[in-house]
């Protein structure tokens, strides 16, 4: 069976074939080539010399136990290697040679049981190193690690390794890798020689599931003192086993290290008192908290020295009380527990994002719903009711608003967002508003996006309401029940590139309300239910227009509409997907593909 | 299309068949099996992805006695720090996992279940397999 | 299962009117588009009307401008047709259609009514 052209010339899909050695029916430019799922079984020198362009190998679960010296010899250009799952037994020292420009090895689950005997020292341009899941059972990284000096990825996570001792790092002191990110999660760690990690820098630490009790954890993260650490996560997976206790004196430790972002990633337990638990957290940058419980939410409102807080995936028993001067970023999504929204006090409050959690808000918005006059970046998607009972007073900084899919009210009954005058982005899609207001978008003067898919219009028809969104590049009007649209709607969008139009129940195409769109560049009417033209005549749509969208409309293809046809015919280098332009009538030419018509007035008669 | 045995609890009998063409081997373990009334225990997999499950995703599409509920989705894997281990698994990485399940209270009435899980992962989104469940409920009391 | 009966057919002298009638059961489709599309004998079934939701939209097939009119009931659930000056072409079986609620057109269809126009 052959393998599968996704890219002529450049990638090929040969996964599963039941190859027993490499395919020599490839062309020589090939840069992409996966191989895996199949028994290669063993990589002799210049396996791959007929790919010289090669700049990604994947031999993923190949069988592979021996790989010679050379076996890549001829692939300077490869930067991704992947050996995922292959139980190699005999790997020769000259296995990786020749990869002069590889960035990223992939060796999970290879049965790799020292990084000592690894033979990748010579990998200069080396940046990211997986090892995971395989039988490392000590972290030395031996001396070879001095010349990876562009490495910024490290995965030893799900192998053997107990302890960390000072000299294990050692390398680390000769050459600061300054950007290494380093993953030991599924260690089952149970001890760290204290000055192991002092003075030594990493971007990022992960240690999730490494403690298999409260006092190991404890004694570990004392034995991290003196790390400097960009960002640190901690934590527990679901699906592993968990810690029986957890309280403060866990994290004390902490306070011995630098930590500009900290993160806590799961946790089997109930957090009860937070200022206790993050005493030494309080002055990083940005503090992160993923899936977990959180019993009194009155905490937050401590005086603690976050710029960014991140509540993510957490059960709380109420919406928290929120007080932090010096926050500006606040990211709080698809949590449960509190539906209500309550105000917060965040004076310096510049991002909001309260996405995907069930919220309902009495009122909204003003200033003194977040208590900050800096918010630029407010999020409402996914969530409950949201009664607009007020037009955004104080937040007049907004340049980036989305409600979508939540369940939006009074929309319609006064310019709501009349004081936004910086807004460059709106997205009311899925609200259940219903426009039957035309000042609905007054004040929106630099408005370029906006998105409002799947609402509805009173009776159906588009009136003049975009008339001040004169920097309109993006509009979506698309799954709006649209039938009508007054010719004017568009006469002030002389900036507008993209207009979706699908979806709705449009009878017939008509270029005329198209004609001041001098910027238009993608037309979309896809989804529509176009029959015919609205006059017997067709304008041509403006010179800008490079792709016109009619698939999947009920095109009438009798003798007619044979000038509608034949105009169609004469836009054909405009349109898109042209095979999914298909007569709906009469039942005889149903399906048929309209360009492929011979429009003579034989058709019918 | 061959049935695939899970076990038989004291009011329910759980199978599957696979509902696509590729039909990579995929072991399910249920342990105790699943009592529909009340439940507790431990769901055990042993699985080889053909691709990797970072952002792992389900449709599920639930029938009961023929009438379709509507499709649900459930975010497995969110793509970093997820809740669970397995999300970190790369393509032709051996997974070996145990997950702990727990429910109570649900009401059922006597009947044959059907769900389709679709299991989507990856960048670009592809289908990583597709499982038909059937769930044949006697309950002992109703 | 959405069901559509057609009733108002019958045998006309040219220059007459019929007035077509369509009830859907079954589901209501206040929200879809629906139609009338007709068979003349030994040609191919072609739409005739079709009304959109709210009644904003129409179409007809160029035969019959001006002399039918399609309108809807949506309390009722119901389509009309109603058809003047008719003419022996326009003589055929008269079929009311449906959109489905999820957009699909034309997806459900009434057996059709007879209509017969004789000079």
């Known amino acids: 069976e052959p393998c599968v052209e996704v890219v002529p010339n450049i990638t090929y899909q040969c996964m599963e074939l039941n190859f027993y050695k490499i395919p020599d029916n490839l062309p020589f430019s090939t840069k992409n080539l996966d191989l895996s799922f199949n028994p290669l079984r063993h990589l002799g020198s210049y396996s791959f010399f007929s790919f010289p362009e090669l700049q990604v190998l994947d031999l993923s679960r190949c069988e592979i136990q021996t790989i010679e010296d050379g076996a890549y010899q001829s692939l300077s250009h490869l930067s991704t290697l992947i050996l995922t799952g292959n139980p190699i037994q005999s790997l020769a020292l000259g296995a990786f040679s020749g990869l002069s420009s590889l960035q990223k090895l992939v060796a999970v689950e290879t049965n790799l049981a020292s990084l000592e005997n690894f033979p990748i020292g010579h990998l200069k341009t080396l940046k990211e190193l997986n090892v995971a899941h395989n039988l490392i059972q000590s972290f030395k990284l031996p001396e070879y690690f001095s010349n990876l000096t562009n490495l910024e990825h490290l995965d030893l996570s799900s192998n053997k390794i107990q302890s960390i001792y000072c000299t294990d790092l050692r390398v680390l002191h000769q050459m600061p890798l300054l950007n290494l990110s380093l993953d030991l999660s599924l260690n089952p760690m149970n001890f760290i020689q204290p000055g192991a990690f002092k003075e030594i820098r990493l971007h990022k630490l992960t240690l999730r599931n490494n403690f298999d009790s409260l006092n190991v954890m404890k004694t570990c993260i004392q034995g991290l003192a003196g790390l400097e650490v960009h960002r640190l996560v901690l934590g527990e997976f679901r699906n592993e086993g968990n810690l029986e206790k957890f309280d403060k004196s866990a994290l004390e430790g902490l306070c011995n290290l630098t930590i500009e972002e900290f993160r806590l990633a799961y946790l089997d337990y109930y957090l009860d008192d937070i200022i206790d638990l993050f005493n030494c957290l309080t002055n990083v940058s940005s503090f992160s908290l993923v899936s977990v419980t959180i019993e009194r939410v009155k905490d937050f409102s401590y005086n603690f020295g976050w710029q960014h807080l991140e509540l993510v995936n957490c059960k709380f028993g109420q919406f928290p009380t929120l007080k932090l001067k010096s926050l500006k970023r606040l990211t709080f999504t698809s949590n449960k527990g509190g539906n209500a929204f309550s105000e917060v006090d965040l004076p310096s409050l510049e991002f909001l994002d309260l996405s995907r959690n069930g919220l309902s808000f009495k009122g909204c918005c003003s200033q003194s719903d977040f208590g900050t006059t800096s918010l630029k970046y407010l999020d409402l998607s996914f969530n409950g009711v949201i009664t607009m009972s007020s037009n955004f007073l104080g937040l007049e900084q907004l340049e980036h608003l989305d409600f979508q899919h939540s369940n939006l009210k009074q929309m319609s009954e006064f310019s709501v967002f009349l004081s936004l005058r910086n807004l460059i982005y709106l997205d009311i899609s899925h609200t259940h508003t219903r426009v039957a207001f035309n000042g609905i978008f007054n004040g929106l003067s630099s408005l370029e996006v906006l998105k409002m898919a799947g609402n509805s219009f009173q009776e159906n028809f588009l009136p003049d309401i975009f008339t001040e969104l004169r920097n309109l590049t993006f509009l979506d009007l698309s799954q709006c029940q649209l039938e009508q649209l007054s010719p004017t709607a568009f006469n002030s969008l002389s900036s507008l590139q993209v207009l979706n139009m699908s979806h709705n129940n449009f009878f017939s195409l008509d270029t005329f309300p198209y004609k001041c769109l001098n910027s238009l560049q993608v037309l979309d009417y896809s989804l529509n239910h176009i029959m015919t033209s609205k006059k017997q005549e067709l304008q041509h749509f403006p010179s800008s227009l490079a792709f016109l969208n009619l698939t999947q409309n009920d095109f009438a293809c009798t003798c007619e509409h044979q000038s509608f046809l034949q105009w169609i015919k004469d836009q054909r280098q405009l349109l898109v997907e042209v095979e999914r332009m298909e007569c709906a009538t009469p039942s005889d030419k149903q399906g048929m593909p309209v360009l492929s018509l011979n429009i003579t007035c034989q058709m019918n008669k | 299309q061959k049935q695939y045995w899970v076990c038989n609890s004291s009011d329910a009998s759980i199978s599957y068949t696979y509902c696509d063409k590729m039909q990579y081997p995929i072991s399910i373990n249920v342990n105790p099996c699943i009592e529909l009334k009340r439940s507790k225990g431990l769901l055990h997999i042993f699985y080889i992805p053909r691709r990797d499950l970072k952002q792992l995703y389900f449709n599920l599409y639930i029938t009961v006695n023929t009438m379709n509920l509507p499709k649900r989705k459930e975010v497995i894997c969110r793509g970093s720090d997820d809740d669970y281990s397995f999300c970190r698994a790369l393509k032709g990485e051996t997974v070996n996992t145990t997950i702990s399940f727990s429910f109570k209270g649900i009401k059922f009435s006597k009947g044959k279940y059907k769900c389709v899980v679709e299991a989507i992962s990856g960048s670009p989104e592809e289908m990583l397999f597709c499982l038909e469940f059937v769930i044949l409920h006697q309950p002992n009391s109703n | 299962e959405v069901q559509l009966v057609e009733s108002g057919g019958g045998l006309v002298q040219a220059g007459g009117s019929l007035r077509l009638s369509c009830v859907a059961s079954?589901?209501?489709?206040?929200?879809?588009?629906m139609g009338w599309f007709r068979q003349a004998p030994g040609k191919e079934r072609d739409i005739v009307a079709r009304?959109?939701?709210?009644?904003?939209?129409?179409y007809y097939a160029e035969s019959v401008k001006g002399r039918f009119t399609i309108s809807r009931d949506n309390a009722k659930n119901t389509v009309y047709l109603q058809m003047n000056s008719l003419r022996p072409e326009d003589t055929g079986v008269y079929y009311c259609?449906?959109?489905?609620?999820?957009?699909?057109?034309?997806?459900?269809w009434g057996q059709g009514t007879q209509v017969t126009v004789s000079s």
């Open positions: 259609v449906a959109d489905s609620p999820g957009g699909r057109s034309y997806e459900y």
């Open positions: 079954g589901r209501t489709l206040s929200s879809v588009n």
């Open positions: 009304i959109s939701p709210s009644s904003v939209s129409t």
